[in-house]
């Protein structure tokens, strides 16, 4: 099906700013520096193609990508199918975040990306440092006290952590729109569950201790578990599709070159190991440093602390997929009753993990709801 791909989309070689301006949208690019020195690229689409004349403050919407991904996820389809452009055209001030370690967040004031120290992070640090730094920056820049937060996949994970542990940050979130939410991964069918019993020393031995490349570990599973589904050598070697799963039925294959050229955008081996710990434990908790002594050094306790989503009072709307391998419906089922301020939930029976960002019918199934919920919030 996609065995021989001839890149036809110019966005294949573009950065985020170029992708935005290519479609005729205004773009502002900023660098946000976190407390621990990571430099994150943040992009802004301040208005849409047809509403630049509208004066007054526009509600701010911040989009946060998921695991192994980047801000390009929100602008990889045609404008009428990409959430960032849809929101801009609907009159919102749209901001796109990047998590440390990805293509657009691979610099640090103190460490080179060639060093092991640079890659010593997991989603804990994204929640503790990246989100507060980015949200504080947006709040200062726009002069608005609150913003709407849209997260996908790990973007919801770091939202759950940040907004339940950092009350002053939580106050800045008007509504949390969670797409394919991930807290526990007890029931995940993703190939990351194959890694759950690999000890840390062996994990690092196989994958190294810097950026995560899938290596040849996953090859043994692909023929039977991924690629037999009418698939193709190109997707089969891509870590994002390997880990998140794939289904061609709802997928614009003409955009595949864009998806593949921008993904996986990179994360740390430590982050991937954290995810395997979560699969093994079935709990939503901080990174386990491997021994009670090391955990005490980091947490003042012998076990990594649990994250308590019941402490998050931010209003939250949730969309999940019935065919999602990573955010399994059973895990979502465990999450929903713990959310004290759940205002909306929709399960899309045929959706998988990546459909929330790339499906051809995502506007009808998800995005239009978000646009109208934000506009209701305005009143």
């Amino acid at each position: 099906l996609f065995g021989k791909l001839h890149p036809g989309s110019p966005e294949v070689t573009m950065n985020i700013s170029q992708m935005i301006t290519y479609w005729g949208y205004p773009n502002e690019e900023y660098e946000v520096v976190t407390e621990d020195g990571y430099i994150l690229e943040v992009n802004r689409i301040p208005y849409g193609k047809k509403n630049s004349g509208n004066t007054g403050q526009r509600p701010v919407v911040f989009l946060q990508h998921g695991l192994l991904a980047s801000a390009t996820n929100w602008i990889s389809n045609l404008p009428n199918n990409s959430l960032a452009f849809i929101l801009a055209d609907a009159g919102y001030d749209v901001w796109l975040g990047n998590s440390r370690g990805n293509t657009w967040a691979r610099r640090n004031l103190y460490y080179s990306p060639d060093s092991v120290e640079f890659w010593a992070f997991s989603f804990d640090e994204m929640a503790k440092y990246d989100l507060p730094a980015t949200i504080d920056f947006i709040v200062k820049k726009t002069g608005q006290k609150q913003l709407h937060y849209v997260g996908h996949s790990q973007g919801t994970t770091i939202g759950f952590i940040a907004f339940s542990t950092n009350p002053s940050l939580a106050k800045r979130i008007k509504t949390f729109y969670a797409l394919a939410p991930v807290a526990t991964v007890k029931y995940t069918k993703s190939l990351i569950n194959k890694l759950r019993f690999v000890p840390q020393s062996l994990f690092k031995f196989i994958f190294g201790d810097k950026i995560f490349y899938p290596h040849n570990f996953f090859d043994q599973f692909l023929a039977t578990e991924v690629c037999s589904r009418e698939m193709l050598n190109l997707l089969c070697s891509n870590a994002l599709f390997i880990i998140c799963g794939f289904d061609s039925k709802n997928f614009n294959t003409s955009r595949l070159d864009v998806y593949l050229s921008h993904n996986p955008a990179g994360t740390s081996v430590q982050n991937m190991f954290h995810w395997t710990q979560a699969v093994k434990s079935g709990k939503f908790q901080a990174y386990d440093w491997g021994s009670p002594v090391q955990n005490r050094m980091h947490y003042d306790q012998s076990q990594p602390p649990y994250y308590n989503v019941t402490a998050m009072n931010v209003p939250i709307a949730v969309w999940n997929g019935g065919k999602d391998l990573l955010a399994d419906p059973q895990d979502v089922g465990l999450l929903l009753p713990k959310l004290p301020n759940l205002i909306y939930h929709k399960e899309i029976p045929f959706y998988n993990h990546l459909d929330f960002i790339w499906a051809m019918d995502a506007p009808q199934e998800v995005y239009n709801d978000i646009v109208s919920m934000i506009s209701e919030d305005k009143k």
């Epitope: 019993f197 000890p199 290596h215 570990f217 090859d219």
Partner: nanobody
Framework: QVQLQESGGGLVQTGGSLRLSCAAS????????LSWYRQAPGKQREPVAA???????TYADSVKGRFTISRDNIKNTMYLQMNSLTPEDTGVYYC?????????WGQGTQVTVSS
């Protein structure tokens, strides 16, 4: 519960060779990763070689070009061929297997390289 049992260790002179074997009580064909670890005197146990189900291998820098990990699915046995041994290779060698149900260890076999 898979049981693993190493054999083939012993005393060898510098420059010599040994072949370690690891026999499994169950199928090693279903293991995602087969590995050999070394615990040198006074040090932590660390991996020296790993073999993925796909057939790809990874070696510690200190043994690259000298050690070879392999498997025989019919005999349910994995091997570590060790050539050009040096005193730094001395230690207890453990085989390990990682599969869908867990990570399994052997009891270890002593390898001593004399100068």
């Amino acid at each position: 519960q898979v049981q693993l049992q190493e054999s083939g260790g012993g005393l060898v002179q510098t420059g010599g060779s040994l072949r370690l074997s690891c026999a499994a009580s169950g199928s090693i064909g279903s293991m995602y990763v087969l590995s050999w670890y070394r615990q040198a005197p006074g040090k932590q146990r660390e991996p020296v070689a790993a073999l993925m189900g796909s057939g790809s291998t990874t070696y510690a820098d200190s043994v690259k070009g000298r050690f070879t990990i392999s498997r025989d699915n019919i005999k349910n046995t994995m091997y570590l061929q060790m050539n050009s041994l040096t005193p730094e290779d001395t230690g207890v060698y453990y085989c390990a297997g990682t599969g869908a149900e867990g990570h399994y260890w052997g009891q270890g076999t002593q390898v001593t390289v004399s100068s």
